[in-house]
């Protein structure tokens, strides 16, 4: 995990200023309003996780 201004986060992850670390873009499915999800725009949006079938 990299600080901003140094090497970028690994593929499939994006820097979170809120959490001060790289975060997985996959988690934007459940938490789409996370600050780092703006950096995950290359990944198509997925529907929010169902709570119950």
């Amino acid at each position: 995990e990299q600080a901003p201004g140094t090497a970028p986060c690994s593929r499939g992850s994006s820097w979170s200023a809120d959490l001060d670390k790289c975060m997985d873009c996959a988690s934007c499915r459940a938490r789409p309003h996370s600050d780092f999800c703006q950096g995950c725009a290359a990944a198509p949006p997925a529907p929010f996780r169902l709570l119950w079938p």
């Epitope: 499915r29 459940a30 938490r31 990944a43 198509p44 996780r49 709570l51 119950w52």
Partner: antibody
Framework: EVKLGESGGGLVQPGGSMKLSCVAS????????MNWVRQSPEKGLEWVAE??????????HYAESAKGRFTISRDDSRSSVYLQMNNLRAEDTAIYYC??????????WGQGTSVTVSS | DIVLTQSPASLAVSLGQRATISCKAS??????????MQWYQQRPGQSPKLLIK???KLDSGVPARFSGSGSGTDFTLNIHPVEEEDTATYYC?????????FGGGTRLEIK
């Protein structure tokens, strides 16, 4: 360093109540959902309950086995999460772990606290 | 609820060889982009520890001899080469929807 300390377990009779506590440190507690997961030889690992954030109005979700009997809560000022368990049954006997998750992964686990329901 | 079926229930692998563990989900836990499957390791007498997230991404600090693959309903955990310290029970877990569920576990013994 992330630390999670569960407490409050012990021996309780069927029909009794117990409140488990978990104190967390080493990560931004207010930004993580918190879970209780239990483990028994009979049922293996079993998710019990989850509580989300203040911005989610502290939304809670429960496994079917816990609905109506268990209540999860959190105190962000103390970086703590709780599990109030009522009307306990023999099948609730397990080690109970608290675990934070940002979204999908249970990133860290405490040492667990043992609950035994027996007469 | 999504049922996760792990196989085998236990296996013994010689030091330095490959261990392969399967996890099959009763329905797909993948989008076109990501798979919502995790793997955990639980050493004897210890708490579970996250190994792999989103089917194939190693958690920080996890040795590269661990790898995960799969999508849809079929997932695999590979350990190669196995070491003594890998003696543990391994569990899969999905986060596709609530309730989260775990597989029944696979106990790995090193010969």
């Amino acid at each position: 360093e992330v630390k999670l300390g569960e407490s409050g377990g012990g021996l309780v009779q069927p029909g009794g109540s117990m409140k488990l506590s978990c104190v967390a440190s080493g990560f931004p507690f207010t930004k993580y959902w918190m879970n209780w997961v239990r483990q028994s030889p009979e049922k293996g690992l079993e998710w019990v309950a989850e509580i989300r954030l203040k911005s989610d109005n502290y939304a809670t979700h429960y496994a079917e086995s816990a609905k109506g009997r268990f209540t999860i809560s959190r105190d962000d000022s103390r970086s703590s999460v709780y599990l109030q368990m009522n009307n306990l049954r023999a099948e609730d006997t397990a080690i109970y772990y608290c675990s934070p998750t940002y979204a999908d992964t249970m990133d860290y686990w405490g040492q667990g606290t043992s609950v035994t329901v027996s007469s | 609820d999504i049922v996760l079926t792990q196989s085998p229930a236990s296996l013994a692998v010689s030091l330095g060889q490959r261990a392969t563990i399967s996890c099959k989900a009763s329905q797909s836990v993948s989008t076109s982009t990501y798979s919502y499957m995790q793997w955990y390791q639980q050493r004897p007498g210890q708490s579970p520890k996250l190994l792999i997230k989103y089917a194939s991404k190693l958690d920080s600090g996890v040795p590269a001899r661990f790898s995960g693959s799969g999508s849809g309903t079929d997932f695999t955990l590979n350990i190669h080469p196995v070491e003594e310290e890998d003696t543990a029970t391994y569990y899969c877990q999905h986060s596709w929807e609530l309730p989260y569920t775990f597989g029944g576990g696979t106990r790995l013994e090193i010969k």
